[in-house]
């Protein structure tokens, strides 16, 4: 079943996917597509990479982590209700069936009215290159400490991870950062 | 140390075409991505395209597809690219410039440049 | 296309000056932002890439900066040998694009 990811309309919306190149350098073509992952590519594309590029891409949707190094997790520019559904990562991996294919489930909130939050800690100024999702309202922020390459097996873990809301809550608390890996 | 040298200068008619050499020495050659690039006087610098000797496998800008044609010799170590249909606005100096995955495919060695000026 | 702007064509400095030179992405290229000096009649040269790496041999009064859509090289002690074109480019999509040029010169 697909993990899901929320956020809230306006807000960017985070989907995490990764792998490890087989050696640095060795990138695969990656594809983001709206809906599930069918038994070849990716269907609707809204994004995709080839063996060193960006090469098509639609507005509203990038790659803000090091993709180079295996990070190519969607970002999602200012969602609306219309965002919410499916989507596919899937690793093209070179041979007949050798695909890794992951589903992710985006959950759009509508926006809370809510009185201004007490200005948090920037922790992108504290730990550059960091990657944020923004949780269940304005002032949740689930923040990821410097991520190392991750391998294909550990992405339910970290998926697991993130949707976990007392998490979130420790996060947002704590003021404490995860590192994987 | 790594170097890339590239043939002269070329004058050619609107209509012709034109193919510039890259001779790459001081590095593997299959290891690297050539990229071309190109100047037109007192401009900017327009990305053409990039070819990879390793696999041969090519990506061109848009702009000239079907136009471009990107080679490599692997034998002698030299890349080529060839524009046909030339237009006078093809008029510039023509950079072959390496690039590889340790600076996140930028172009680190670049060729002195050929000058290709296309008049009648 | 992903569109790089410089806003400021040519730029006045003295020797000892520090200097920012500013590149604007049509969109967010996360870090994937290169920096080049081109002095006349010569070739690019690579300065900075991935937004904050220094390439081989630059000296250390050039650094790079900034992320997603706006990105800035710094020089922090001006020489004379630094006057030149900079251009930034965006390694982030094919086709990859470069700003249209600042050129330094001198006050």
């Known amino acids: 079943s697909e993990v899901e990811y929320r956020a809230e309309v306006g807000q960017n919306a985070y989907l995490p996917c990764f792998y490890t190149p087989a050696a640095p350098g060795n990138l695969v073509p990656v594809c983001w597509g709206k809906g599930a992952c069918p038994v070849f590519e990716c269907g609707n594309v809204v994004l995709r990479t080839d063996e060193r590029d960006v090469n098509y891409w639609t507005s509203r949707y990038w790659l803000n982590g090091d993709f180079r190094k295996g990070d190519v997790s969607l970002t999602i520019e200012n969602v609306t209700l219309a965002d919410s559904g499916i989507y596919c990562c899937r690793i093209q991996i070179p041979g007949i069936m050798n695909d890794e294919k992951f589903n992710l489930k985006l959950v759009i909130k509508p926006a809370k009215v809510t009185p201004a939050p007490t200005r948090q800690r920037d922790f992108t100024a504290a730990f550059p290159r960091m990657l944020t999702t923004r949780g269940h309202g304005p002032a949740e922020t689930q923040t990821l400490g410097s991520l190392p390459d991750i391998n294909l097996t550990q992405i339910s873990t970290l998926a697991n991870e993130l949707r976990d809301s007392r998490l979130a809550n420790d996060l947002r608390d704590s003021g404490a950062t995860i590192r994987i890996g | 140390q790594v170097q890339l040298v590239q043939s002269g200068a070329e004058v050619k008619k609107p209509g012709a075409s034109v193919k510039v050499s890259c001779k790459a020495s001081?590095?593997?050659?299959?290891?690297?991505?050539m990229d071309w690039v190109r100047q037109a006087p007192g401009q900017g610098l327009e990305w053409l395209g990039y070819?990879?000797?390793?696999?041969?496998?090519?990506s061109y800008n848009q702009k000239f597809k079907g136009r471009v044609t990107m080679t490599t010799d692997k034998s002698t170590s030299t890349a080529y690219m060839e524009l046909r249909s030339l237009r006078s606005d093809d008029t510039a100096v023509y950079y072959c410039a390496r690039s590889g995955y340790g600076n996140y495919y930028t172009m680190d060695y670049w060729g002195q440049g050929t000058t290709v000026t296309v008049s009648s | 296309d992903i569109v790089m702007t410089q806003s400021q064509k040519f730029m006045s400095t003295s020797v000892g000056d520090r200097v920012s030179i500013t590149c604007k992405a049509s969109?967010?290229?996360?870090?994937?932002v290169a920096w080049y000096q081109q002095k006349p009649g010569q070739s690019p040269k690579l300065l900075i890439y991935?937004?904050?790496n220094r390439y081989t041999g630059v000296p250390d009064r050039f650094t790079g900066s900034g992320s997603g859509t706006d990105f800035t090289l710094t020089i922090s002690n001006m020489q004379s040998e630094d006057l030149a074109d900079y251009f930034c480019?965006?390694?982030?999509?094919?086709?990859?694009?470069f700003g249209g040029g600042t050129k330094l010169e001198i006050k």
């Open positions: 070819i990879y000797p390793n696999k041969g496998g090519t």
């Open positions: 001081g590095y593997t050659f299959t290891d690297y991505y």
């Open positions: 480019q965006q390694h982030y999509s094919s086709p990859s694009t």
């Open positions: 991935y937004a904050s």
């Open positions: 969109q967010s290229v996360g870090n994937n």
